[in-house]
């Protein structure tokens, strides 16, 4: 399950003499092109990450599906450590999601994309934890309710990650993973899942539809979106309190 | 449906300033960065400014730097172009731009046109 | 900055015509390239994002490719709602840099 290595090579930043903690970093110290990086968050080994330059700053696309040409039906394994390609689909892995993040809040940016071409841009501030809390999401209100909180404490909810072997998901009677698909931050299964089955047609049986790639409160619950993009922006550690 | 639409251009003097304004409907505005973008005959399509979906970070062309100032209301989903010190090379006609985060400019205003001439 | 290099700056075709306007980046913009049509006295409405993916409501004839550094936008018949002035935005670097302009006209 481990990322493809990439074809070209990762630009050099020389204003570091280290490499960039991540693409935030890379951006502020000038950077203003897109592409692959090497960066080596704090106490992390170096790895590759996709970074996109915004008038928001260095963004790490952290997932991105637009063809079904990847598997993302995967165990807690993969989804830990990251699979697919850097230059089509791919899941960045939640370690090194989680490495770039630390403690600190960030920034999620979801780019969603029907088959009729209509586009949704959402984004969140949110909290992911370490693999102790099964790199769990700490959200506020307004996403909660997307991911299967039915009520939100005023903390916010703390969602975990589950797959199909590792079942953490807040619903008591099912694994959302193993009757949905793929690894996601569940919660009670029917809100999101943007790492299920990529399905170019609408399935007839409503069991396979249940499957795939949706985001209820956008196109509808088992709307198989055509393109997801997801990316993370740690906020500035004074920003996290 | 998305739709941006442009006022406050016209005829200015050489060092007047102008204020350009841009209100946004159709989508979550304080989701997207916007910009202005200008286009005259002989120059084409220039970027000229860009903000931040907070409107705390802000980026100009170097040849409006410290004349222009891009700003952004959310509360009023209205983007705005304060243009000082302006010069003839400034006539164009500016479009107010909404930025995606993964396929960048994707919705343009009708555009409004600014003239500098004495 | 990344420069963008686009041509033809004019092209002569006629209803039915197949054309092909090409985008050379100075380097590798990762298929971040949108390409837009824009008539007279109108704002630029965008074709394709990404390289080869279609805006929504846009006609099936309009098409994009390309990698690296060299982009296409292909029009496969030629409509006369067609004739318009065409370029090209790589996004790869911000802020973004435009193609000089296509302008397309009747043979």
């Known amino acids: 399950p481990e990322m493809a290595q990439p074809v070209d090579p990762a630009h050099n930043v020389s204003r570091l003499h280290r490499l960039p903690r991540d693409c935030q970093e890379l951006f502020q110290v000038g950077e203003r092109q897109s592409g692959l990086f090497e960066i080596q968050p704090q106490g992390s080994p170096p790895f590759l990450v996709n970074c996109k330059m915004t008038s928001d700053g260095g963004w790490t696309v952290i997932q991105r599906r637009h063809d079904g040409s990847v598997d993302f039906n995967r165990p807690w394994e993969a989804y830990k450590a990251g699979f697919g390609d850097p230059h089509g689909e791919f899941w960045l892995g939640l370690e090194k999601v989680h490495s770039i993040t630390g403690d600190r809040n960030s920034r999620l940016a979801v780019q969603l994309r029907d088959w009729d071409g209509n586009a949704e841009l959402l984004q969140f501030s949110v909290h992911l934890g370490g693999e102790d809390t099964a790199y769990s999401l700490q959200l506020t209100a307004p996403v909660a309710g997307q991911l299967g909180a039915t009520t939100v404490p005023p903390s916010g909810l703390s969602v975990p990650f589950s797959t199909w072997d590792q079942d953490h998901d807040l619903r008591r009677d099912k694994n959302c993973a193993k009757s949905l698909s793929g690894g996601w931050w569940f919660g009670t299964c029917s809100h999101s899942n943007l790492n299920g089955q990529y399905f170019r047609s609408i399935p007839q049986q409503r069991q396979k539809l249940k499957k795939g790639i949706f985001w209820k409160t956008w196109r509808g619950r088992y709307y198989p979106l055509q393109a997801t993009t997801m990316l993370i922006q740690p906020m500035a550690a004074e920003a996290a309190s | 449906e998305v739709q941006l639409v442009e006022s406050g251009g016209g005829l200015v003097q050489p060092g007047r300033s102008l204020k350009l304004s841009c209100a946004a409907s159709?989508?979550?505005?304080?989701?997207?960065?916007m910009a202005w973008v200008r286009q005259t005959p002989t120059k084409g399509l220039e970027w000229v400014a860009s903000?931040?979906?907070?409107?705390?970070?802000?980026y100009y062309r170097d040849s409006v730097k410290g004349r222009f100032t891009i700003s952004r209301d959310n509360a009023k989903n209205t983007q705005y172009l304060q243009m000082d010190s302006l010069r003839s090379e400034d006539t164009a006609t500016y479009y107010c731009?909404?930025?995606?985060?993964?396929?960048?400019?994707?919705?343009w205003g009708q555009g409004v046109m600014v003239t500098v001439s004495s | 900055d990344i420069q963008m290099t686009q041509s033809p700056s004019f092209l002569s075709a006629s209803v039915g015509d197949r054309v092909t306007i090409n985008c050379k980046a100075s380097?590798?913009?990762?298929?971040?390239l949108n390409w837009y049509q824009q008539k007279l006295g109108e704002a630029p409405k965008r074709l394709i994002y990404n390289t080869n993916n279609l805006q929504t409501g846009i006609p099936s004839r309009f098409s994009g490719s390309g990698s690296g550094t060299d982009y296409t936008l292909t029009i496969s018949s030629l409509q006369p709602e067609d004739f318009a002035t065409y370029f090209c935005l790589q996004h790869n670097s911000f802020p973004g840099t435009f193609g000089g302009g296509t302008k397309l006209e009747l043979k």
């Open positions: 380097q590798n913009i990762n298929k971040y």
């Open positions: 159709g989508f979550t505005f304080s989701n997207y960065g």
């Open positions: 731009a909404r930025q995606g985060f993964t396929e960048d400019t994707d919705y």
């Open positions: 903000i931040s979906t907070g409107g705390s970070d802000t």
